[in-house]
Amino acid sequence: VPRWRQQWSGPGTTKRFPETVLARCVKYTEIHPEMRHVDCQSVWDAFKGAFISKHPCNITEEDYQPLMKLGTQTVPCNKILLWSRIKDLAHQFTQVQRDMFTLEDTLLGYLADDLTWCGEFNTSKINYQSCPDWRKDCSNNPVSVFWKTVSRRFAEAACDVVHVMLNGSRSKIFDKNSTFGSVEVHNLQPEKVQTLEAWVIHGGREDSRDLCQDPTIKELESIISKRNIQFSCKNIYRPDKFLQCVKNPEDSSCTSEI
């Protein structure tokens, strides 16, 4: 008799999830000498322990505490790049500007990037059929709680000047409901963070508007200023040229505005 299984609105666990997490861990620890001490089997056990046999709408930050402890990694606090709705460009940037870090450049972020996972209450099975959707089902699901936990801690670690890349092509350039807007902004520590500098990335080639004047950016400035952190904003009119100039800053065309 087939066992009844909860049907959620979101996609199920990414296929070969355990193998993927373990392989990513091994790869990351091989590439990053400072993380060579990490035992990837223990990391997987801690990851699994956070959600296996638990109701996938009842996950807490505490469930991920053992994983957070095993994944402890000192990130240079003044080299943090946050992003919202423009992940690919942020990652392309840190691949070139190797001394800066997005969350996905850390072990924990790298392990989980683009993956989905959930379990079932009272069984040791991973649910490959469906997982809770944040909107349609519940917010305290394994994936959302993981990203909320690591994002909060990543923001808490930041100091001096923190950069954030924002997507200027979206109707809400700054979205209060994004992870950046709902978690990271509120967990920057004013005792350590002097300035949040937003880089607004333009989409259209002929778009010469000053998107730093956008109402949502003004809203971000207001939130940040109320937290006693300074705010600055730059337009990145040509993201392709921006990346090229990060790669080759001596290029003669890189002195003009990008």
């Epitope: 930050e61 402890k69 994944g71 990130v75 808490e156």
Partner: nanobody, 119 residues
Framework: QVKLEESGGGLVQPGESLRLSCSAS???????????MSWYRQGPGKQRELVAS???????TYADSVKGRFTISRDNAKNTAYLQMDSLKPEDTAVYYC??????????WGQGTQVTVSS
């Protein structure tokens, strides 16, 4: 310079109490409240084991062997964590270590303080 300093250890009789303190100093602890604070212990000839921890959100966890006897707490204004140890037993004899951990800032340890429970 980062420093975690334990104090409050000593020699007591079974059934008595001790209160350990862990004071954090150095620029890394400018925002002490974001660190999870833990107490570990290492008894003679034993592995280091977690005794108690308190998260930045003040959630506490305890080893089964100390539940109901030990209480962990923190004072963020003083950059200090505490371990109140009541009804001490001879098997609580160990060097007690303080640990401060933040996922993206680092994992820091004190030098340890000796607790001996003996009649």
């Amino acid at each position: 310079q980062v420093k975690l300093e334990e104090s409050g250890g000593g020699l007591v009789q079974p059934g008595e109490s001790l209160r350990l303190s862990c004071s954090a100093s150095g620029s890394i602890f400018k925002v002490f409240r974001v660190f999870a604070m833990s107490w570990y212990r290492q008894g003679p000839g034993k592995q280091r084991e977690l005794v108690a921890s308190i998260s930045s959100g003040e959630t506490t966890t305890y080893a089964d062997s100390v539940k109901g006897r030990f209480t962990i707490s923190r004072d963020n204004a003083k950059n200090t964590a505490y371990l109140q140890m009541d009804s001490l037993k001879p098997e609580d004899t160990a060097v007690y270590y303080c640990n401060a951990d933040h996922t993206f800032t680092g994992d820091f340890w004190g030098q340890g303080t000796q607790v001996t429970v003996s009649s």
